[in-house]
């Protein structure tokens, strides 16, 4: 059956032979209506990439550099299955390219000029492409030929396989630049030995190299890693201090109509029948015909790449930056230490307009990028299409898991001038009901619920976390009869109460009328029994404070809070009647952009923050007529975090634990991708 056939692309006679064997053996173990293999032979991996894009083949396994080529237009391929190494219990699908130095040296990443460098080999990922790609814009001009620029940047190097005649400085630490193990400083162990012997000041290797060469922790403690933010960390902290995370070997397919489920079904069956130590007659991860045919011999199996993970996310910002710099050879005109405009990520149409207005008023210091959901915005910040946005704590958690860092906190209670340096305790997540109802925390089952959005703190993580510990399952749509929780599955009962309009029904952005704090409260006013919001929501939308038609006549006393002990209290008493304390919303950014974002925002709030009194004829950063566009409208200032500069420290142990528990019920494709 053609639609059940996976056309595998082979790049040599030997690969084609193995592919035919793969095809025949799979036929013998799979049912006739299951997936099948067909083989397509091409001259090179690049030809395979083009063939898949043109729908002449379906899959091929590629190294990281070729995954980059596959992702570029017009190919637009995406990773669908990853080879893993190590054990099934602790599968490794990535390695980390690191810069190792001796602990007793005193320079940082931005002080490598004039040092001596040790590389695994010319053109190799961890030893050359990544470090030189990331240093590219610091190299002296002209940057072509590249070897000459590198030779003039470092005071001496060992770059195995380089041309020692044309570029003698690249072979200064290993005469001849031998391209095999006859050169004692060749490859990973060799580059590390070059550092260890004192020949070089820095070695560009894999994170595992240090562990493979130094079994003793005391010996490893004599070395450190250079981080991109110009700090150092211990060699154990490679996940937080590396030049790039590099995928090892990956199966790619078309982004649209790519048969990824079929490819996974095929490879999953293949690893069951012909994986490591499974079969004598055919082995997926070895071959009598040659090394690394179709798949790496060192692979132990396959893992499905989460569907939300596109090639940009899979390869990572640092890796793509390095490879793009090397391939395109372009550098920004401004010096790299100068802050370029900050690209703010705006959610859908309304936020984009406010962001545009901010951009004009900032004289272009702020630029705007849009996405339809918060998760899409986070992904854009991760891959460099945007730089920053302000997030509810639930999304600060997801952003943190995706490698972003909190930069500034929204403060709601501290008056100026102390605001900028004050760390607030947070706000209260509350459950609001109509005073006329007889609801309590203990009889919510079967009622109609209103939520700010799935994944947000007050509207979801806190109430659903508490509910989960009571009902011990994730079927929240069965607990409530119906509700509006923007971001839920469209056919879920938790979208039934949403107002839309139609194509935007239940979307987690301002196009859905019941989205956010004000939207969830409106949902309660018009249709629901309980709304999960922040403690300020009722006062901010009653007594004529919200002029919209649905809100202008509402009275605060017509609403009450549900307390966890089964009682109810006035909305004026949130301190004594709340579900939990929630961390304030915070601005997040990539680590490399955090300082720029902080500096610019502190400057912007001095001009457009809460000191502006007349928002009807001036731009106000923290004002959008109860719509909470870009920032919460009740923000007094953006405050420095001081030492709360990681998502764990910012959110606090208790909240992180609560959200981690709720991950069993996670509907976040981005979180799944970021924890792959």
């Amino acid at each position: 059956v053609p639609e059940k056939s996976v056309r595998w692309c082979a790049v040599s006679e030997h690969e084609a032979t193995k592919c035919q064997s793969f095809r025949d053996h799979m036929k013998s173990v799979l049912p006739s209506n299951g997936p099948s293999v067909a083989c397509v032979k091409k001259a090179s991996h690049l030809d395979c990439i083009r063939a898949i894009a043109a729908n002449e083949a379906d899959a091929v396994t590629l190294d990281a550099g070729l995954v980059y080529d596959a992702y570029l237009a017009p190919n637009n391929l995406k990773p669908v299955v990853a080879e893993f190494y190590g054990s099934k219990e602790d599968p490794q699908t990535f390695y980390y390219a690191v810069a190792v130095v001796k602990k007793d040296s005193d320079f940082q990443m931005n002080q490598l000029r004039g040092r001596k460098s040790c590389h695994t080999g010319l053109g190799r990922s961890a030893g050359w492409n990544i470090p030189i790609g990331l240093l590219y814009c610091d190299l002296p001009e002209p940057r072509k030929p590249l070897e000459k620029a590198v030779a003039n940047f470092f005071s001496g190097s060992c770059v195995p396989c380089a041309d020692g005649t044309d570029f003698p400085q690249l072979c200064q630490l290993c005469p001849g630049c031998g391209c095999s193990t006859l050169n004692q400083y060749f490859s990973y162990s060799g580059a590390f030995k070059c550092l260890k012997d004192g020949a070089g000041d820095v070695a560009f290797v894999k994170h595992s190299t240090i562990f493979e060469n130094l079994a003793n922790k005391a010996d490893r403690d004599q070395y450190e890693l250079l981080c991109l933010d110009n700090t150092r960390k211990s060699v154990d902290e490679y996940k937080d201090c590396h030049l790039a995370r590099v995928p090892s070997h990956t199966v790619v397919a078309r982004s649209v109509g790519g048969k990824e489920d079929l490819i996974w079904e095929l490879l999953n069956q293949a690893q069951e029948h012909f994986g490591k130590d499974k079969s004598k007659e055919f082995q997926l991860f070895s071959s009598p015909h040659g090394k690394d045919l179709l798949f790496k011999d060192s692979a132990h199996g396959f893992l499905k790449v989460p569907p939300r993970m596109d090639a940009k996310m899979y390869l990572g910002y640092e890796y793509i930056t390095a490879i793009r710099n090397l391939r395109e050879g372009t550098c920004p005109e401004a010096p790299t230490d100068e802050c370029k405009p900050v690209k703010w990520c705006a959610l859908s149409h309304h936020e984009r307009l406010k962001c545009d207005e901010w951009s004009v008023n900032s004289a272009g210091k702020i630029e705007c990028e849009s996405a339809e959901t918060t998760e899409d915005c986070i992904a854009k910040i991760m891959n460099g299409e945007a730089d920053a946005m302000s997030l509810d704590g639930g999304f600060v958690y997801i952003a943190g898991m995706c490698g972003l860092v909190p930069v500034l906190a929204e403060n709601y209670n501290t008056p100026n001038p102390n605001c900028e340096n004050t760390a607030e305790e947070g706000y209260f997540a509350v459950a609001v009901v109509k005073s006329s109802s007889d609801l309590t925390w203990d009889n919510l089952k079967g009622k109609k619920s209103c939520h700010t959005a799935v994944g947000r703190t007050a509207g979801w993580n806190i109430p659903m976390g508490l509910l989960y510990s009571k009902i011990n399952h994730c079927r929240f749509d069965e607990f409530f009869s119906e509700g509006c929780a923007p971001g839920s599955e469209k056919n879920s009962s938790l979208c039934k109460l949403c107002m839309g309009p139609s194509p935007n029904l239940c979307e987690p952005n301002n196009k859905e009328g019941y989205y956010g704090y004000t939207g969830a409260f409106r949902c309660l006013v018009e249709k629901g029994d309980v709304a999960f919001v922040k403690h300020q929501t009722v006062p901010q939308n009653t007594g004529g404070k919200n002029p919209d038609a649905w809100a202008k006549n509402l009275k605060e006393e017509d609403y009450e809070l549900l307390c966890l002990d089964g009682s109810r209290k006035s909305v004026q008493e949130p301190a004594n009647c709340h579900l939990a304390r929630a961390p304030n919303h915070a601005v997040v950014a990539r680590k490399d952009k955090a300082d720029c974002v902080q500096t610019l925002l502190l400057d912007q709030q001095r001009m457009f923050g809460s000191s502006v009194t007349d928002c009807s004829s001036n731009f106000c950063l923290f004002e959008s007529k109860t719509k909470d566009l870009l920032f919460r409208d009740d923000t007094v200032c953006l405050a420095k975090l001081h030492d709360r500069n990681t998502y764990e420290k910012y959110l606090g142990e208790e909240y992180v634990k609560a959200v981690t528990n709720l991950r069993k019920c996670s509907t976040s494709p981005l979180l799944e991708a970021c924890t792959f």
């Epitope: 309304h350 936020e351 307009l353 406010k354 545009d356 207005e357 004009v360 008023n361 004289a363 009807s616 004829s617 001036n618 731009f619 959008s624 007529k625 719509k627 566009l629």
Partner: nanobody, 117 residues
Framework: QVQLVESGGGLVQPGGSLRLSCAAS????????MAWYRQAPGKQRELVAG???????TYAGSVKGRFTISRDNAKNTVYLQMNSLKPEDTAVYYC???????????WGQGTQVTVSS
């Protein structure tokens, strides 16, 4: 609420110039930032240029150096001088005052600009 009327569009050859005007009436005391947007068929509406009451301006990268935004506060009018026009500048051009546009969708009729030989 502010009413906005755009004018000045038309058909022009590549390399040519046009000057768009946008006249505001209604609660004009509330106008701070004004901007020109454009929307080409099948594309999202995008910011072309903006200007604050005090004259701070910003431009989309694709029009920098070719387009100039200005305003006459006495006449409550904002202008967009478009030089060195290119076929990719073809779109309906709208002006907005921002005072209400990001709460409700208040957009004028726009003015069509077509750049073609």
């Amino acid at each position: 609420q502010v009413q906005l009327v755009e004018s000045g569009g038309g058909l022009v050859q590549p390399g040519g110039s046009l000057r768009l005007s946008c006249a505001a009436s209604g609660s004009i005391f509330s106008i701070n930032t004004m901007a020109w947007y454009r929307q080409a068929p099948g594309k999202q509406r995008e910011l072309v240029a903006g200007i604050t009451r005090s004259g701070t301006t910003t431009y989309a990268g694709s029009v920098k150096g070719r387009f100039t935004i200005s305003r006459d506060n006495a006449k409550n009018t904002v202008y967009l001088q478009m030089n060195s026009l290119k076929p990719e500048d073809t779109a309906v051009y709208y002006c907005t005052d921002y005072s209400s546009s990001y709460y409700q969708d208040y957009w004028g009729q726009g003015t069509q600009v077509t750049v073609s030989s």
